[in-house]
Interface confidence: medium
């Protein structure tokens, strides 16, 4: 299925920088195919617009949002519509397009630049140089030995997975990076477009653990688009 | 296991100041953000400041902004407020709060009277 | 401002099930899917109850459960006891700029 295809629980499926640098070694961050998206059941070109079916965001492109067609349509009808633009009316942030979240109702600026070199700052903390970027690899290849003596314990800083004890990942929360629980079954889980709202993304889940893909509830498909849950499921 | 301990409150007149510590112990205090959240008697909580591990990384609430100041001392182990300018709506009780899986482990609180 | 709105009161039986909810706006609850729930008994300090929305920290009851629909979460306690009795505040998080944002606090009464 697309689910599966695309199994992609928060650091998984990020672009960079925010979600750090892509294929790089060590990093549980990787990022998706910049090519293809999926509109509706089949992936689609970018410049090859047109309304799929949808059941949720997710399933539209990155400048898409799904929702009926029609004002107070049947909600059982939902199509890709074009992504809203700033100080344009909204419901969510998935409503606005890239650069832009929802806030009382009303798309604005994400103001990327500020957000971006916030976290940047954060994450590179440990290094004492406030301006490394995420994409300085130089800089993340080592954690500062004097701040990890040992695998980081949950609610820990960390600069990647492996920095992580068993059983923990490495994730964003807050303005910086730390070791959270892998997901359980039953859990909740967040499966990802390539959107530029991830920058307002502070707060990352884990993978689902082994055996299990992120998937929505069973016994959600029939509610409202806004309370679909994905879960850790078997296989 | 995790242990935050406030100090430093007290009674203070309006536009006076106060410096609020907790020290922290049971964990590694410089791998993790802290925080601290107010609740004036009767009332909810508030979040007041939180600070990032290495201290370089501040945000606080339109409340205090410009009036307190939030710092850290790792190899204290201790979190501080520096409150200035106090108002009398600033009367709380202080708690510092480690932020990890959000704010998951806090302290018992040190109380703040702002009167003449 | 961003507010969280919660109902000042609430209160059950013994064994029974009770909810609390938590309205938001698209910026926090239900921009983010991410809600805490906290536990406050009286002098004492909040316990981080629920995180991200459905899970539980080590050591907190099973009876405790969160769920999250829109721009509404909820904390539902099952099998009520004397000492749930307390207050909760849901918890969530602003973009613009980032800061924690509190609901007003529900006042949990365990009935008879």
């Known amino acids: 299925t697309l689910n599966s295809v695309l199994n992609s629980n928060a650091i998984k499926n990020l672009p960079p920088p925010l979600g750090g640098a892509a294929g790089h070694p060590g990093s549980a961050v990787s990022a998706a195919p910049g090519i293809l998206y999926p509109g509706g059941n089949k992936y689609q070109t970018i410049d090859n617009y047109q309304p799929y079916p949808c059941a949720e965001d997710e399933e539209c492109g990155t400048d898409e949002y799904c929702a009926s067609p029609t004002r107070g349509g049947d909600a059982g009808v939902q199509i890709c519509l074009a992504c809203r633009k700033r100080r344009k009316r909204c419901m969510r942030h998935a409503m606005c397009c890239p650069g832009n979240y929802c806030k009382n109702g009303i798309c604005v600026s994400s103001d990327q630049n500020n957000f971006r070199g916030e976290i940047e700052e954060t994450i590179t903390e440990s290094f004492g140089n406030d301006h490394s970027t995420l994409d300085g690899y130089s800089r993340r290849t080592t954690l500062s030995s004097k701040m990890y003596h040992s695998k980081g314990q949950e609610g820990s800083v960390c600069l990647r997975s492996s920095d992580c004890a068993t059983g923990l990942c490495c994730a964003r929360h807050f303005w910086s990076k730390i070791c959270k629980p892998v997901l359980k079954e039953g859990q909740v889980c967040t499966k990802h477009r390539r959107k530029g709202s991830h920058g307002l993304e502070i707060f990352q889940r884990c993978y689902c653990g082994e055996g299990l893909s992120c998937r929505i509830q069973k016994d959600h498909h029939q509610a409202s688009n806004s309370s679909r849950l994905h879960t850790c499921q078997r296989h | 296991q995790v242990q935050l301990v406030e100090s430093g409150g007290g009674l203070v007149q309006p536009g006076g100041s106060l410096r609020l510590s907790c020290a922290a112990s049971?964990?590694?205090?410089?791998?993790?953000?802290m925080s601290w959240v107010r609740q004036a008697p009767g009332k909810g909580l508030e979040w007041v400041s939180g600070?990032?591990?290495?201290?370089?990384?501040?945000h606080y609430a339109d409340s205090v902004k410009g009036r307190f100041t939030i710092s850290r001392d790792n190899s204290k182990n201790t979190l501080y407020l520096q409150m200035n300018s106090l108002r009398a709506e600033d009367t709380a009780v202080y708690y510092c709060?480690?932020?990890?899986?959000?704010?998951?482990?806090w302290g018992q609180g040190t109380l703040v009277t702002v009167s003449s | 401002d961003i507010a969280l709105t919660q109902p000042a009161s609430v209160s059950g039986s013994p064994g029974q099930s009770i909810t609390i909810s938590c309205t938001g706006t698209?910026?926090?609850?239900?921009?983010?899917?991410?809600v805490s729930w906290y536990q406050q008994h009286p002098g004492k300090a909040p316990k981080l109850m629920i995180h991200d929305g459905s899970n539980r920290p080590s050591g907190v009851s099973n009876r405790f459960s969160g769920s999250k629909s829109g721009n509404t979460a909820s904390l539902t306690i099952s099998g009520l006891q004397a000492e749930d009795e307390a207050d909760y505040y849901c918890q969530s998080w602003d973009v613009s700029p980032i800061t924690a944002v509190f609901g007003g606090g529900t006042k949990l009464t365990v009935l008879g």
């Open positions: 049971g964990f590694t205090f410089s791998s993790y953000w």
């Open positions: 698209s910026s926090d609850v239900g921009g983010f899917n991410y």
């Open positions: 709060a480690r932020m990890g899986i959000d704010l998951d482990y």
């Open positions: 600070i990032s591990y290495s201290g370089s990384n501040t």
